[in-house]
């Protein structure tokens, strides 16, 4: 027979030859690391056939770590379920409850002995440290010091010293999460209001007020003759601008009565545009011009449609 | 305080043009839009147009042709200019702000008279 | 363009009286109503806006109220110091538009 097998878990005594006889018997010990648990032979033997007669290692069993109990508020849970060396615990903690020291555990083997990697870890309840006060704004529960998880406060603005109100900007409730911080920003109050929003040639239909606070949302249609430029639909933001912003309504184009001349690569043409009357201030652009970021009324249209009038 | 003041010609023949100045105080240009409106003696009030925070202009269509509203933000000067006047253009002419960013008028300048007349 | 039309043209009241000024507009305005005072010196004044709401400085003496095309003025009170004449203007259709205007006498 040639050199005899070899396993994972055992190892062959003494040194390997490279030729053996029929009938000579080799014998295995336990690896570092595991130990042997009878009946199962750690022998084998070169027959006939000039193969080894079956064995395997499965006698020898991996040295296991001490059992780890479930930390309190929480579970310790074995990797492949079991404790062997070269595996990990993993621990976690209940909901409302939070980790503190190492969230893995690995069983490792010091000399033939197996122990964990360090000590196992705690579960400590999640406590918040009381919400962030906001200007111009007040929060429930401002007396108390230690909130606990999942405990929530509500914030509301103050009345304005002025003729605006503030605007709770955000969410209003917030609530005590994990890793003991609170689940999202506190919200801000301040005055957002817009202008009143200006379409000519068209009207507001939705949306009436006497002033326009956040999240106010109108709607608008164009006369008789015009079509919408932009959303029907605009709604005040947090910046105090209009999102999307104020539509135009622009002059429907008169269907075309003369086909243009077919024009060829060699024939030079000059474009003439007829400035619209309505430019009291010298010609007009017959593009159109970029629309302004002010948060304010649109400007009149001053694009190509308008010099068809 | 808020004031507005509007200096004009006075007098304009037929056919020529009007410019009238409004100087503002207590205020900035950036931040208030401001509408001229005229008053004929013994009538009523018009709108004539207005000029927005950012530039930006409308005008009454009745106007639109031989009407310009223009300012110079840093010497707080709103200009009116008017084309072709007529006797029936003969008016107060007041310079007005809006409150803020609404379109009602709160202040008002005293108005200044023009008289077309030959 | 909204017209809008002023009623009566001119009044007289007495001291002390309860007067009312209307104005209707020529289509739906849903409130974007403006009441000015002109006094005979010719300086203007805002006194309410979108319809009933005061503007800062203006006694409480003065009210307005309406919808749809219909709204009014109210001088609870009359005094001396009113005597002016009144003008409605529509705010939410360009071209901004003004109330012919209605003339306030003492009896």
């Known amino acids: 027979c040639e050199e005899p097998p070899t396993f994972e878990a055992m190892e062959l005594i003494g040194k390997p030859k490279p030729y053996y006889e029929i009938g000579e018997r080799v014998d295995y010990k336990c690896k570092k690391g595991y130990f042997y648990i009878p009946p199962l032979a750690t022998h084998t033997i070169c027959d006939r056939n000039h193969t080894w007669l079956p064995v395997s290692d499965d006698a020898c069993y991996r040295e296991t770590c001490p059992y780890i109990r479930d930390p309190l508020n929480g579970q310790a849970v074995p990797a492949n379920g079991t404790y062997e060396f070269g595996y990990q615990m993993h621990f976690i903690c209940n909901e409302g409850y939070y980790l503190i020291g190492e969230e893995i555990l690995y069983c490792e083997l010091k000399g033939s002995v197996a122990i964990w990697s360090g000590k196992p870890p705690i579960c400590e309840k999640v406590l918040c440290t009381p919400p962030p006060k906001i200007k111009n704004g007040k929060h429930t529960f401002s007396e108390v010091e230690v909130f606990e998880y999942l405990d929530a406060v509500t914030y509301s603005c103050d009345p304005a010293p002025g003729p605006d109100p503030f605007s709770l900007i955000g969410e209003s409730t917030i609530y005590c999460g994990d890793n003991s911080v609170w689940s999202r920003a506190a919200p801000e109050c301040k005055v957002v209001k817009c202008r009143f929003p200006v379409v000519e040639n068209g009207k507001q239909i939705s949306g009436f007020g006497k002033k326009f606070y956040y999240k106010a949302t109108v709607m608008f249609e164009c006369d008789k003759g015009f079509y919408l430029d932009g959303s029907d639909t605009i709604v005040c933001d947090s910046n105090s601008t209009w999102d999307p912003p104020v539509p135009k309504c622009l002059k429907v184009l008169p269907p075309s009565s003369t086909k243009p001349p077919a024009l060829s690569h060699s024939v030079s043409t000059s474009s003439t545009t007829k400035s619209p009357a309505s430019s009291a201030s010298g010609p007009r652009p017959t593009y159109k011009p970029p629309v302004s970021n002010y948060p304010g009324y649109p400007k009149p249209e001053e694009g190509i449609l308008d010099s068809l009038d | 305080q808020v004031q507005l003041k509007e200096s004009g010609p006075g007098l304009v023949a037929p056919s020529q043009n009007l410019s009238i100045t409004c100087t503002v105080s207590?205020?900035?240009?950036?931040?208030?839009?401001i509408s001229w409106i005229r008053q004929p003696p013994g009538k009523g009030l018009e709108w004539l147009g207005v000029?927005?925070?950012?530039?930006?202009?409308n005008y009454n269509s009745a106007f639109m042709s031989r009407l310009s509203i223009s300012k110079d933000n840093s010497k707080s000067q709103v200009f009116l200019k008017m084309n072709s006047l007529q006797t029936d253009d003969t008016a107060i002419y007041y310079c007005?702000?809006?409150?803020?960013?609404?379109?009602?008028?709160?202040?008002w300048g005293q108005g200044t008279l023009v008289t077309v007349s030959a | 363009d909204i017209q809008m039309t002023q009623t009566p043209s001119s009044l007289s009241a007495s001291l002390g009286d309860r007067v009312t000024i209307s104005c209707s507009a020529s289509q739906g305005i849903s409130n974007y109503l403006n009441w000015y005072q002109q006094k005979p010196d010719g300086t203007v004044k805002l006194l309410i806006y979108y319809t009933s709401s005061l503007h800062s400085g203006v006694p409480s003496r003065f009210s307005g109220s309406g919808s749809g095309t219909d709204y009014s003025l109210t001088i609870s009170n009359l005094e001396p110091e009113d005597i002016a004449t009144y003008y409605c203007q529509q705010y939410i259709k360009l071209p901004w538009t003004f109330g012919g205007g209605t003339k306030l006498a003492i009896k």
């Open positions: 000029i927005w925070t950012d530039g930006g202009t």
């Open positions: 207590g205020f900035s240009l950036t931040s208030y839009d």
């Open positions: 007005v702000r809006v409150y803020d960013g609404y379109p009602w008028f709160a202040y």
